[in-house]
């Protein structure tokens, strides 16, 4: 009988130890959750405040309607220009209208004067068709004025108030474009 009682007591003690362990684990887990929660709240707070304070375009970018433009201060070939824009979460400039073309050329006049700037336009080697980088066709009024005599790949660039074409491997400035952030405030 005594043996039976001591066995039950040992079992109860074992149970108690397991429950204490479980409680300890739970407390640890709760603390870790609270820390994670704090981190998440801080992260969200940070994101919200930066979104609240952010202007529609990043620093050193120019805004026009729904777009932001970055005018480069370095030269590069067309393909590297595209990669430089992607790095910034943008693509080479895609001119959708005469109004946009006028804004770009007007801004360039103010900023830098008469230089060459790559845009996201290139000519298909087989068909000779001009296409924007997203695969769409430019509107008839926005085709490069002169056909390049280059045997190499031909890309589009802006100079003064004209859209022209040149060997994609020549070095020029470039213009990147991304969408402006909508203000939700």
């Amino acid at each position: 009988k005594l043996l039976q009682v001591s066995t039950i007591a040992m079992q109860q003690q074992e149970k108690l130890i397991q429950q204490e362990r479980a409680l300890l684990n739970f407390t640890e887990w709760k603390r870790s959750c609270a820390l994670q929660m704090k981190y998440c709240q801080a992260f969200m707070q940070n994101s919200l405040s930066s979104a609240h304070n952010s202007s529609p375009c990043p620093n050193n970018w120019i805004q026009n309607r729904e777009s932001c433009y970055y005018v480069s201060e370095i030269w590069s070939i067309w393909h590297t220009s595209q990669e430089n824009c992607l790095k910034e979460g943008s693509t080479l400039l895609q001119i959708e209208s005469k109004e946009e073309m006028d804004f770009i050329t007007g801004s360039l006049r103010k900023i830098k004067g008469s230089y060459d700037y790559w845009v996201g336009l290139s000519q298909d080697g087989h068909s000779g068709r001009w296409l924007w980088q997203d695969g769409s066709s430019p509107s008839p009024g926005l085709l490069p004025a002169e056909r390049s005599q280059s045997a190499n790949q031909v890309c589009g660039y802006v100079k003064s108030n004209s859209l022209l074409s040149s060997n994609c491997s020549t070095w020029k400035y470039f213009i990147c474009e991304k969408y402006a952030l909508r203000s939700s405030v």
């Epitope: 992607l86 979460g89 693509t91 695969g135 991304k178 969408y179």
Partner: nanobody, 116 residues
């Protein structure tokens, strides 16, 4: 650290189609753009297609009209649907990411072979 794992490569006949996928994992908080490059034997690595965080697209001339890039934001997955494949599309295809710090990460690559 960011890890990129490509899949979907293989052997296909001329005119056939393939869909490449790239799964991104690790500390991906903010991505500026994702894209696909390819490198054929003895040639330089070239950009095939890219998509920015805003959904702006950029394709190489050789990819226009035949390839489509897409992204599943929720699953951090990038796809490249390739159709009307030609022998000259044979290459190792690499997935890439540009993060907010303008750092570029690369996958290990997946081989695409188009037999004529």
């Amino acid at each position: 650290q960011v890890q990129l794992q490509e899949s979907g490569g293989g052997l296909v006949e001329t005119g056939g189609s393939l869909r490449l996928s790239c799964a991104a994992s690790g500390s991906i908080f903010s991505i500026n753009a994702m894209g696909w490059y390819r490198q054929a034997p003895g040639k330089q690595r070239e950009l095939v297609a890219a998509i920015t965080d805003q959904g702006r697209l950029a394709y190489a001339d050789s990819a226009k009209g035949r390839f489509t890039i897409s992204r599943e934001n929720a699953r951090n997955t990038l796809h490249l649907q390739m159709s009307s494949l030609k022998a000259e599309d044979t290459a190792v295809y690499y997935c890439t990411i540009w993060d907010r710090d303008r750092q570029q990460y690369w996958g290990q690559g997946t081989q695409v072979t188009v037999s004529s």
